[in-house]
Structures are given as C-alpha cells and as structure tokens.
Interface confidence: low
Amino acid sequence: DVNEAPQFSQHVFQAKVSEDVAIGTKVGNVTAKDPEGLDISYSLRGDTRGWLKIDHVTGEIFSVAPLDREAGSPYRVQVVATEVGGSSLSSVSEFHLILMDVNDNPPRLAKDYTGLFFCHPLSAPGSLIFEATDDDQHLFRGPHFTFSLGSGSLQNDWEVSKINGTHARLSTRHTEFEEREYVVLIRINDGGRPPLEGIVSLPVTFCSCVEGSCFRPAGHKHHHHHH
C-alpha cells in the first residue's frame, strides 16, 4: 500500500479581482485531498511580489499588499499541498490572479429628470444641465464620463457639451420648436476598461407658461429650467 501525494482538485486555480481590492480581502482558494485521508497543509511558493498569503488549513488566499496592476496580469504563484504527518509528501498547483479594473455598471442619470421644460416659444436658444453617475467604485479616480447625442437626427436641434467628468449641458440649436414633448437621447461613456456606455433619455417639454410655470392639466408637476 504505497503512500500517495495529495491531489489538487484543479491543475490551475484562477481568480479575478480589482486592483483596488482592500488589503486582507479573500481573493481565491484552493483545495486538495490526500488519498490516505491525512490532513493537508497549504503554502505558497513564488510570491515574488509579496501580495498574497494562504490559510494553511483552509487553502483560502488573501491579499496582504496593494495589487499593482502595472506589474502585469495575471500574477502567477505556486500552491503547495503537503501531508501533515506520514511521509510529508507534497503536490504543486498553480494559482493565477487576474487583476481587473472593475467596471460593470453603465452610466446613468444621477436623478430623475422628468419634468424638464422650456417656455414656448423660445426667445433665445436655451440650455439645461444634467448629471451622470454609475455604480462602480472610483478609488484612484472619479468618474470621467463623456457625453454625446444618442442619434444623428438629434443634431439638427440639440447639442450636448461636457462641463466636467460628471456634468454636461444640453442646449437647443435654435428656437423653432413645436409646443410638445421632445425625447432627447444622450449617450454617456464611462471611459473604463472596457468602456461601458449608457443611453439615457431626457424628456423635454416645450409648453405655454403661466407665471413661469408650464401650464398643464392638474396632476402634472413640472420643474423649471433656466434658459
């Protein structure tokens, strides 16, 4: 009855984490079993950047330092499973840590922009300001959104200009609008890796005004925007 070395469940274990993951975060785990049922102790080999530690009992792997994405990805280390007791036979597997900028939430409008209006007829081109956001964490950098009109046909009537990384201005190109609601599609790009885009709609009403407010049937409340 020959004593056998521990056997890993995989030849290569792979995990993906953000480069900005907090120190102490669990980034993955490995598992091995010993054919004779002996306990196993896990250790790391080749952690040249000093980024990781492994729980020698559970095989859980944790970050212990900032993960510097410029150092290259994936980060490859070896995991060693050694029998506790017996003849201390060991096996080696690979652990690959893929560093990512987490960017999985497309941009959206920061608040509810229903009820935008201009008093009709326009005496001069008008504009309004809107804000975008997303649900990604921005640790080293804040959002850097870029803005454009969502379809070419809108360009005759509207233009959008960036104010900063989160705000943009929607302006009318002329004053000849009908007394009705226009839905302006805005394309917002987050410039991430990979870049994500959101297309949002800004409903803008051109309406007759009474004392600076949109004259509407009861139950329709509208917010005034300066122009």
């Epitope: 000093g50 900032p66 510097d68 410029e70 150092a71 290259g72 080293f140 890796r193």
Partner: antibody, heavy 118, light 107 residues
Amino acid sequence: QVTLKESGPGILQPSQTLSLTCSFSGFSLSTSGMGVSWIRQPSGKGLEWLAHIFWDDDKRYNPSLKSRLTISKDTSRNQVFLKITSVDTADSATYYCARRVLSTFDVWGAGTSVTVSS
Amino acid sequence: DIQMTQTTSSLSASLGDRVTISCSASQGINNYLNWYQQKPDGTVKLLIYYTSSLHSGVPSRFSGSGSGTDFSLTISNLEPEDIATYYCQQYSKLPLTFGGGTKLEIK
C-alpha cells in the same frame, strides 16, 4: 539599453505654463507593465513624485498638484509630456522622468533644471 | 499621504566602514519600499526594491531590511563611489512618497 532624457524651457516666468518632454529609448510604452513618472527635486531638497502614465494611457497624479498637472504620451515617438500650469517660484526644481516597472523607478533620466523667475 | 522620514540627514563614515541608513513610514507599508542613490552630479539609480531585493548590477555590499514601518539600507564595506545621497520611497499607497534623503560623506 534603456535611456531617458528630459527637456524643458530652462527659465520661465510666474503664471506661465511649464512644458516638459521626456524622450526615451530601449523600451516601448505600448508594452504591458510599462509606465513613466515625473519626479522633481527643488535645489537642496528631496524628491517629490508628480505624475505617472501607464502603457494604456491610464494616469495618476499627486493630489497636492493634481489641478495643475497634465501628463500625456506619444507612444509612437517614445515621448512623455508634463504640463504644469500657473507656475510659481516654488516650482523651480530639477525635473526627472523615470521608467516605472514592477513598482520601481528602475531607470532615471539625468534631469532638466527649471527656474521660475520674474 | 504616507510620510517617509529619514531622521539622519547627513552621515560621515570612513572607507571600509559598515554604514546603516534608516527610514521610517508613518504607517505600515507591507515591505513596499525602494532605495535610491543620487550621486553629487544628480544621477539617480535604483539600489533595492521590495525592502530587500537587490536591483540587477548593484554591488552586493548594499542590502536592505525592515518590515512594518521601520526600514534600513546597509552598506557593508564603504567604497569611495558610495558617496551620495540615499532616498527611501514607499509604493504602498498613492501618492508615492520619498524620504528626505541621507547624505553620506567620507571622514
């Protein structure tokens, strides 16, 4: 052989914009893992990290100067640029560019001296 | 920001001496520390990275050690060409910060 060389105006006046160029050879800024930083050293003082640009055009700035700094690159010409707006006499220093790979500034340029004086 | 402090701004030693230059961080930096040498002409070179790893081409008389917040650079057998200012630098958190430097002179 990796080399970097900084160039700048030498002397400029307060409130002007300082434009610096780092020309390098022996490596490519299109290679994954590569980056270039700017570091400065006022005469007789220590080193201060200013900005870094990654191979994929991602950028990092020192928060204390971020509003005045712009780092950029021309990968095809093997050049990295730094602009500092609204300079003051406190910006007088020797400015270095350095290759940053695996978290180290492993090769530095010789530096270029900049004096801000009215 | 993480403050890097080199308490000794200048140090005088004799050729052949063993010299130790210290550096402390205002918070733990997980061994994310480099050492640089700046010659009197302004030339800067990397000596040690990740606290104790010797950069290629650097003489073995240079060594680094430390952990947590306290680190040191040791020159085991001082040579004339070692006359320079030595800087520590952390890369645990942005912004990257340097110590104030320790100027090494010959007695």
